[in-house]
């Protein structure tokens, strides 16, 4: 959401979020690191091109023309400088001048050593318990953001991991139309459209950077779960990794796993949609997970096959009209899982990414809650790995990513909601090793993949 320094009456009233970097001569003297040439405070660029007509409530949602309902001036950083005050480097760069390249490696969780697995689990748990050092979350919509007295900003601290959950919730929540009116649910700023892959890519990148800083460990990387096993078991659901099934309740995580102690955020949908409040940092019940346990839907009791990945990578167009969950021959809609692995849309199909979520059959299968289950991270790093392989094979051909008329939030130049500083879909539509400072250690199955007898 927004940097703590900008969650003030003055910043919100002025519409300027340009924090100081090293203000030696008092507040406001080094906005965006301007004194050292790192950046400057400038007008926000927000996409104003038309979106598709399925969203008919222009003017009613804070996420429109993000982030202009809150701020119209932000830091524009020079060269490889980055961050809310230009105090950090763009992904893949380091050093005081951000002029040295770095490359971290995202690996298969199952390939990590015992120590590395343990370190990753501990790091996630630390992120769940550690207040985010930079960002605070809004607990009210923009018209109520200064509180009943007009002088009390409605923001809360939140943990690093819960911030990861909250940003996802905020991107998928319904549009509140007023007390007594039904909220509008045919809106999603991070799914069912071209921005699905770019949005989730930045979402992971932000968590990874937050965890690197939390650990003081620049090499820290998020591993992936290769969910395309074709199995009806969750191979990472063991107590040394993401937690096995509880013996006491088949929908809970074993008490031998630290994740059994985790409590979810953003579960009070009734309140949000009827009162117009936003999810806050309050934690509720435990993570629910029952892999392969949805007997009412046999098609989600087995994970995708390895050849499903190979097939989806042969879909050469990034996206196709109507740039929605019913697109055919769209790589994005195929990997998202609304089309079959060959690209053919079928309303009954749930494949790849969607199938992996639904297979988990619990918290991880509910869109507004899904990141509460940390398997979400691993599921999405694998999805991102597939995306990166597509970008490599097809030379990051952005031509079919629409500039306009995509679902709201999904135009190519839209600032992804609710990330700060503003970042467009275009910025994430690049090969990761060359542009974002990470790579995947992975072998892709060929089309002819067959399981040995």
């Amino acid at each position: 959401q927004f940097p703590r320094q900008c969650a003030t009456v003055e910043a919100l009233r002025s519409g300027m979020c340009c924090p100081d970097l090293s203000p030696v001569s008092g507040p406001g003297t080094d906005r965006c690191g301007s004194s050292s040439g790192r950046g400057r405070c400038e007008a926000v660029t927000a996409d104003s091109r038309p979106h598709s007509p399925q969203y008919p409530h222009d003017g009613r949602d804070d996420r429109e023309v993000w982030p202009l309902r809150f701020f119209n001036r932000t830091c524009h950083c020079n060269g490889n400088f980055s961050g809310h005050n230009c105090g950090t480097c763009r992904p893949g760069w380091r050093g005081a001048a951000c002029d040295q390249r770095v490359l971290i490696v995202r690996r298969n969780l199952l390939d990590l050593s015992k120590e590395e697995k343990n370190h990753f689990v501990r790091a996630l748990d630390m992120a769940k318990r550690t207040t985010h050092p930079l960002f605070v979350i809004a607990t009210r919509r923009s018209e109520e953001i200064l509180g009943p007295d007009g002088n009390t900003p409605q923001f809360e601290n939140i943990s690093i991991y819960n911030y990861f959950v909250w940003t996802h919730y905020y991107s998928v929540k319904k549009t509140f139309l007023g007390v007594g009116q039904e909220s509008f649910g045919e809106v999603d700023f991070s799914h069912e459209g071209p921005a699905f892959l770019t949005w989730h890519r930045y979402h992971l990148l932000r968590l990874e950077k937050d965890m690197q800083e939390m650990l003081q460990e620049p090499s820290f990387s998020l591993p992936y779960w290769n969910f395309a096993t074709g199995k009806n078991v969750c191979d990472i659901c063991t107590d040394d990794l993401m937690g096995s099934r509880s013996n006491f309740d088949s929908t809970l995580i074993s008490p031998n796993s630290v994740f059994s102690q985790w409590r979810v955020v953003c579960d009070s949908l009734e309140d949000y949609d009827t009162l117009g409040t936003l999810c806050n940092s309050t934690e509720d019940g435990p993570i629910r997970r029952n892999p392969a346990g949805n007997v009412a839907r046999p098609m989600v009791q087995r994970l995708p096959e390895p050849q499903d990945v190979a097939q989806c990578l042969e879909v050469g167009l990034f996206d196709t009209p109507p740039f929605y969950s019913n697109s055919t021959n769209s790589f994005r809609n195929t990997v998202e899982g609304y089309s079959d692995p060959t690209g053919k849309y079928d309303p009954a199909v749930r494949s790849l990414h969607n199938l992996a979520h639904l297979f988990l059959n619990g918290t991880g299968g509910q869109t507004h809650l899904s990141p509460n289950d940390p398997i979400f991270v691993l599921l999405h790093t694998f999805t991102d790995a597939v995306f990166d392989e597509w970008l490599r094979r097809y030379n990051a051909d952005i031509s079919t990513f629409p500039l306009e008329n995509a679902p709201i939030g999904h135009n190519r130049q839209y600032n992804m909601v609710p990330f700060w500083p503003p970042v467009t879909n275009t910025e994430m539509f690049v090969t990761a090793p060359d542009n974002l400072g990470y790579t995947y250690e992975i072998q892709w199955p060929s089309r002819e993949f067959s399981v040995p007898e």
Epitope: R94, Q100, L103, T130, T131, M214, L215, Q216, P218
Partner: antibody, heavy 121, light 107 residues
């Protein structure tokens, strides 16, 4: 002036525990990560772990996990290293030191004078 | 976990000479490296950070260089006060291990 003032020498019995302190001045410990380093007699330096005094987070080298415990008291600008289950192998000088994380600066820039721990029966 | 191999273990040189100490990491550490000097009975003292940036107050006869897995500390125009032990340390991945050290004796 930045200073890290460590507690005095300790003579302890095998199996016992010891708690070393490191009182800082000249900077706010909430803005830095405080690290601890061990040096056995006539040996090199071994990194033990760090604490973030602002939130109490700690990370240890796996070989010190379970025997070393780091804590901080921000009201007195002091960090502590507790060592348990001591053996003669833990006889060493223990240093506290700080890391400035500005621009991910790779360095421990100020060090305490060291605290000698001798484990002997 | 990254291992740091430091060489030589010891060396002896005369005042005015130039010496080079090297550290090899078992993987790329992307310049996340510091060099320290430690005199007998004293605390280590920071010389170089980020592989090549001289710490405040360190004489310019000290210089750090290298990239990837290979790093070195060069001391030119040796002075008697340069005797002591020298250590490298990486900050790329946990744990932040040190090199085994180099004992420098001034003849």
């Amino acid at each position: 002036e930045v200073q890290l003032q460590q507690s005095g020498a300790e003579l302890v019995r095998p199996g016992a525990l010891v708690k070393l302190s490191c009182k800082t001045s000249g900077f706010n410990i909430k803005d830095y990560f405080l690290h601890w380093v061990r040096q056995r007699p006539d040996q090199g330096l071994e990194w033990i772990g760090w604490i973030n005094p602002d939130n109490g987070n700690t990370v240890y080298d796996p070989k010190f996990q379970g025997t070393a415990s780091l804590t901080a008291d921000t009201s007195s600008n002091t960090v502590y290293l507790q060592l348990s289950g001591l053996t003669s192998e833990d006889t060493a000088v223990y240093f506290c030191t700080r890391r400035d994380y500005t621009y991910e600066k790779a360095a421990l820039d100020y060090w305490g004078q060291g605290a000698s721990v001798i484990v002997s029966s | 976990c990254i291992q740091m191999s430091q060489s030589p273990a010891s060396l002896s040189a005369s005042v005015g000479e130039t010496v080079t100490i090297t550290c090899r990491a078992s993987g790329n550490i992307y310049n996340y490296l510091a060099w320290y000097q430690q005199k007998q009975g004293k605390s280590p003292h920071l010389l170089v950070y980020d592989a090549k940036t001289l710490a405040d107050g360190v004489p310019s006869r000290f210089s750090g260089s290298g990239s990837g897995t290979q790093y070195s500390l060069k001391i030119s125009s040796l002075q008697t006060e340069d005797s002591g032990n020298y250590y490298c340390q990486h900050f790329w991945s946990l744990p932040f291990t040190f090199g085994s050290g180099t004992k420098l004796e001034i003849k």
